[in-house]
């Protein structure tokens, strides 16, 4: 399956906190958006191929990396403002 | 805009070729093919946007109807871990 | 028909800088990845990297760093790559070759090739 | 960089005989292998993709197989116009890396 930690997280003003994803589906791509209450999924990054990584709609403020395929982890800096949301983590082959 | 899938089950031996459509009266902008393990949460498999539209993914073949109001996806020389419940969404 | 149309032959001294184009045609060009690839006289291929001609992105192989730069022009359908302070190690014959977004597709078609040979 | 061990370097074969050339890899990269024929002048061409993909207008005397880090590419019935160069490349993993070759000549 696809595994993603913590489940919540609080970030002291000015910190960069990372959230994990871990798969073991042997997927290829992997994503990870954003929801804010209410509204849809937005994209914040995707990659397709270990190595290699792509800005999403809103990238600011976030950064990953992709060094083993089972892995994308995603970064949120403190240079995103505004946080507070709930972060998804999908695949795909 | 309610997508009827066909066949609802399929079962097959290991190596033949399978085919699955997705039809609607309604046209969209775009339909996403999923699977599905026992389990476990859909996981995306494509997104077909433009009528006509194929995309190959392996041994998956996706078309999208010239009207966008069909799809259907083919499996060529089927193996085991295809097994699964394949889902259309758009 | 998928074709991907290289310029010409480069004669080219050490030093130098030299720019190669490879024009699209019979597919949606921001559609797919474009690769370049090198092969030197009598041997095996390397790749150098890829241009998503959608977003720009670009991905290198790190041995080709600051030896090539990847561009596009999306209006004429035209990839590029600019290779510079020549030597004789770049003469070669380079590809370039275009694979699907998604999935993440090896090369299907290629270029015809563009000869380099750089010489004093 | 995954490194690719293709065997052998050269083959001279007759017509009607087997040929199988293999391509290892150091790391498991799944069925992300992909293989090439390219005759002298030519560019590469794609005969199979990820998954033993048999690519459109191959012939069928052409086989691939493999998962993980061994893999096999396999002409059947070797015919006169089957005299080529041939690369594995893996697209598990970037950079994309090729095998260093394997020529195919006629006995």
């Known amino acids: 399956g696809i595994t993603q930690s913590p489940k919540y997280l609080f970030r002291k003003e000015g910190q960069n906190v990372t959230l994990s994803c871990e798969q073991n589906l042997n997927h290829d791509a992997m994503y990870w958006y954003r929801q804010d209450p209410g509204q849809g999924l937005r994209l914040i990054y995707y990659s397709q191929i270990v190595n290699d990584f792509q800005k999403g709609d809103i990238a600011e403020g976030y950064s990953v990396s992709r060094e083993k395929k089972e892995s994308f982890p995603l970064t949120v800096t403190s240079a995103q403002k505004n946080p507070t949301a709930f972060y998804l983590c999908a695949s795909s082959i | 805009q309610l997508l009827e899938q066909s066949p609802q089950f399929l079962s097959i031996q290991e190596g033949e070729n399978l085919t699955v459509y997705c039809n609607s009266s309604s046209v969209f902008s775009s339909l996403q093919w999923y699977r599905q393990e026992p389990g476990e949460g859909p996981v995306l498999l494509v997104t077909v946007v433009t009528g006509g539209e194929v995309k190959k993914l392996k041994r998956l073949t996706f078309q999208f109807g010239d009207a966008r109001k069909d799809s259907s996806l083919h499996i060529t020389a089927a193996q085991t871990g295809d097994t699964g419940l394949y889902l259309c969404a758009g | 028909e998928v074709q991907l149309q290289e310029s010409g032959p480069e004669l080219v001294k050490p030093g130098a800088s030299v720019k190669m184009s490879c024009k699209a045609s019979g597919y949606t060009f921001t559609d797919d990845n474009m690769h370049w690839v090198k092969q030197s006289h009598g041997k095996s291929l390397e790749w150098i990297g890829y241009?998503?001609?959608?977003?720009?992105?670009?991905n290198y192989n790190q041995k080709f760093k600051g030896k090539a730069t990847l561009t596009v022009n999306k209006s004429s359908s035209t990839a590029y790559m600019e290779l510079r302070s020549l030597t004789s190690e770049d003469s070669a014959v380079y590809f370039c070759?275009?694979?699907?977004?998604?999935?993440?597709?090896?090369?299907?078609?290629w270029g015809q090739g563009t000869s380099v040979t750089v010489s004093s | 960089d995954i490194v690719m061990t293709q065997s052998p370097a050269s083959l001279s074969m007759a017509i009607g005989e087997k040929v199988t050339i293999r391509c290892i890899t150091i790391?498991?990269?799944?069925?992300?292998m992909n293989w090439y024929q390219q005759k002298p002048g030519e560019p590469p061409k794609l005969l199979f993709s990820?998954?033993?993909t048999l690519r459109p207008g191959v012939p069928s005397r052409f086989s691939s197989s493999g998962y993980g880090s061994d893999f096999a590419f396999t002409i059947e019935n070797m015919l006169s116009e089957d005299v080529a160069d041939y690369y594995c490349?893996?697209?598990?993993?970037?950079?994309?890396?090729f095998g260093a070759g394997t020529k195919l000549e006629l006995k």
């Open positions: 490349l893996q697209s598990d993993n970037l950079p994309l890396t």
């Open positions: 790391t498991d990269i799944d069925d992300d």
């Open positions: 990820e998954g033993n």
């Open positions: 070759a275009r694979s699907t977004v998604v999935p993440f597709y090896a090369m299907d078609y």
């Open positions: 241009i998503n001609p959608n977003n720009n992105h670009t």
